[in-house]
Interface confidence: low
């Protein structure tokens, strides 16, 4: 009672390989590598059939089918293109993500290249079988910033993109006395992150408490150039106000904060985050040069008094920017404390601006970032925030401009950006 | 050059309480953060606890809540940890350390430690 | 709570080897992570600071490097003052955690 010869399957082995099949005989039907036993529609690794008494077959000789990837998944902010001819998404066929430049670029830099497996599964030599992350593009506006500034105060029209990273903030509070509304600027540091000042939302009451204004009182815009027109901008609502816990109204020390927007904002030429700078304690050196953006004041023949007494506004229509240098500590603190009144430089401070005025950030451009050039990593970098500065005119003689020094805030921003508490799960790049 | 001088050994009967000193020089006390470490002899290390000199602001590890209290004496730029309901387990060398910049919990200057021993 | 395990108790080296302590995080706690060294009856002194910078007056020969779980600090050419435990530490979430600590000796 013998069994006919077997055919191996196309792609396939008959194990063991025997001159003659007699009853009981069994035989294993197995697959090369990338492809998979077909029996009736069911995919399988091995396949067996037997010799009968009657000298067939208990089952024909399945096909050996090629192992399918399917479609690959969707990378967001990415996108999947294939580099095998017919978008083949079968056994060693090969795609390659890649990010939205040049607004998002990839973690970890991988080639983005990846293969169907013999297991049918899109693997990556460094990712195995995880998607790679798209991460957003930090300091690198699509417009390059310039060179040279002329004589914010003394400042110019900036062009639209110029300053990617820069929000408006808009505060209505109804706790505030006298004044129920006020602005200030931040800095996008993600799709979901908005680096400011703690001042500019601490609720103003009369007291020396510091409250953080309710959520629903914020408002955030984006890719805003021209403050009459905010039909360009993109508007978001905040999901958290967090304030440094020792922010300090006296003296302004600590003065740093964080708004969560409620959803990721898109990202594109006008809306573009800015870079963290490393944890390191000294900031930046004296005499770097920085720019900052604001639609603060830009009158300089006003005093900051005056304005707070007569309780107008007289902000900048388009955003305004300013170069600055770094001012020495020792000379900022001599500066300050010579003065009549109790100024505090602190070491979570660096100053800025000319011995001779002229140049300087003013009121409405508070929680606006200082921002210089990294050589190194060639980003824009955040070292400060618009702060505060003396009672005189903005850009008086010898008044410095000061600035909470963000490098001693890494890990602060780091803690809350990733912690439990955060509305959801954000990667920021560091 | 900053220093932090932590008070002399201590020997504490079990149950009692004990309050250990940290006088910090050479920096702006109310400026920087001012953690404690506990160490047990052939151990590693365990932070129980961190204040703000500048607010009194504190925040405790769960671990050590109702055990350790601290607080800061601006006038002497000094800090405490008061250790109460003293046993065994309580017998070790704490530290207290200050960040190397105000953020970031990392510590760059540290006491030279006191060893509590409880025993009766 | 964060563990940071140093799965090495003990590493034996002689003067002029590399040698590399090594430490895992139960979580992903990104670049945040400090090196300390010890010696017996002193207090622990920073080497590293997120994860790869050297602290000031830390000796070239000490590097740290690692992000998310896996950190790494690498003392090249030891020398005999380098004979100490060293610790790890997370401070990407509170409460801040150490490592149990890797003891550095001669063969």
């Known amino acids: 009672n013998e069994c006919p010869k077997l055919q191996p399957p196309v792609y396939g082995k008959i194990e063991p390989s025997q001159a003659v099949y007699s009853f009981k005989d069994q035989v294993l039907v197995s697959c090369d590598t990338g492809y998979k036993v077909l029996k009736d529609n069911g995919v399988m690794d091995t396949f067996q059939i037997e010799c009968l008494k009657d000298g067939a077959w208990s089952n024909k000789i399945p096909t050996c089918k090629i192992v399918d990837c399917g479609a690959p998944a969707g990378l967001k902010h990415g996108l999947v293109t294939f580099s095998t001819r017919n978008n083949l998404t079968t056994y060693k066929s090969e795609i390659r993500y890649s990010c939205q430049q040049p607004y998002y670029k990839m973690l970890h830099n991988t080639t983005g290249v990846y293969t169907c497996s013999a297991h049918g599964t899109w693997t990556n030599e460094v990712l195995k079988r995880s998607l790679p992350t798209c991460l957003p593009v930090c300091g690198q506006p699509s417009r390059a910033l310039p060179n040279l500034v002329k004589r914010i105060i003394g400042g110019r029209n900036a062009e639209l993109g110029l300053f990617p990273w820069q929000a408006l903030i808009v505060v209505e509070d109804t706790s505030r006395v006298p004044n129920d509304k006020w602005f200030g600027s931040g800095a996008l540091l993600s799709e979901s992150w908005i680096l400011t000042a703690a001042h500019v939302l601490r609720s103003q009451r009369r007291d020396n408490t510091v409250i953080p204004v309710s959520k629903e009182h914020v408002t955030v815009y984006l890719g805003l150039h021209d403050v009459r027109d905010k039909s360009g901008a993109v508007n978001s609502s905040a999901a958290r106000v967090i304030l440094h816990p020792d922010f300090n109204i006296q003296n302004y020390n600590h003065d740093i904060a964080l708004v969560q927007l409620q959803k990721p904002v898109p990202l594109g030429a006008h809306v573009m985050p800015i870079c963290l700078p490393r944890p390191e304690p000294e900031g930046p050196a004296p005499h770097m040069l920085g720019l900052v953006a604001g639609w603060g004041i830009s009158n300089p023949n006003v005093t900051v008094d005056e304005i707070i007494l007569s309780g107008t506004r007289t902000l900048s229509d388009v955003l305004q920017y300013v170069k600055l240098p770094v001012v020495s500590h020792a000379e900022c603190k001599a500066s300050y404390e010579s003065r009549s009144g109790n100024y505090s430089v602190t070491e979570n401070m660096f100053c800025a601006g000319y011995y001779e005025g002229g140049k300087d950030t003013c009121l409405g451009d508070s929680g606006g970032a200082f921002v210089i050039f990294d050589e190194m990593s060639q980003h824009w970098v955040a070292q400060g925030l618009v702060s505060w500065g003396g009672p005189e005119e903005c850009g008086s003689k010898q008044v410095y401009g000061v600035y909470t020094k963000v490098s001693n805030y890494v890990d602060w921003l780091w803690e809350e950006m990733n912690s439990p508490r955060a509305v959801r799960d954000l990667q920021v790049e560091r | 050059q900053v220093q932090l001088k932590q008070s002399g050994a201590e020997l504490v009967r079990p149950g009692a309480s004990v309050k250990l000193s940290c006088k910090a020089s050479?920096?702006?006390?109310?400026?920087?953060?001012i953690n404690w470490v506990k160490q047990r002899p052939g151990q590693g290390l365990e932070w129980i606890a961190r204040?703000?000199?500048?607010?009194?602001?504190?925040y405790y590890n769960e671990k050590f809540k109702g055990k350790a209290t601290l607080t800061a004496e601006k006038s002497s730029s000094t800090a405490y940890m008061q250790l109460s309901s003293l046993t065994s387990e309580d017998s070790a060398v704490y530290f207290c350390?200050?960040?190397?910049?105000?953020?970031?919990?990392?510590?760059?200057?540290w006491g030279q430690g006191t060893l509590v021993t409880v025993s009766s | 709570d964060i563990v940071m395990t140093q799965s090495q108790k003990f590493m034996s080296t002689s003067v002029g080897d590399r040698v590399s302590v090594t430490c895992k995080a139960s979580?992903?706690?990104?670049?945040?992570v400090a090196w300390y060294q010890q010696k017996p009856g002193q207090s622990p002194k920073a080497l590293i600071y997120?994860?790869?910078y050297r602290y000031s007056g830390v000796p070239d020969r000490f590097t740290g490097s690692g992000s998310g779980t896996d950190f790494t600090l690498t003392i090249s050419n030891v020398q005999s003052e380098d004979l100490a435990d060293y610790f790890c530490?997370?401070?990407?979430?509170?409460?801040?955690?150490f490592g149990a600590g890797t003891k550095l000796e001669l063969k």
């Open positions: 204040i703000y000199p500048g607010s009194g602001n504190t």
């Open positions: 050479g920096y702006t006390f109310t400026d920087y953060y």
């Open positions: 979580q992903n706690v990104g670049p945040n």
């Open positions: 997120s994860a790869s």
């Open positions: 350390a200050r960040n190397y910049y105000i953020s970031s919990p990392w510590f760059a200057y």
């Open positions: 530490q997370q401070y990407n979430r509170y409460p801040l955690t």
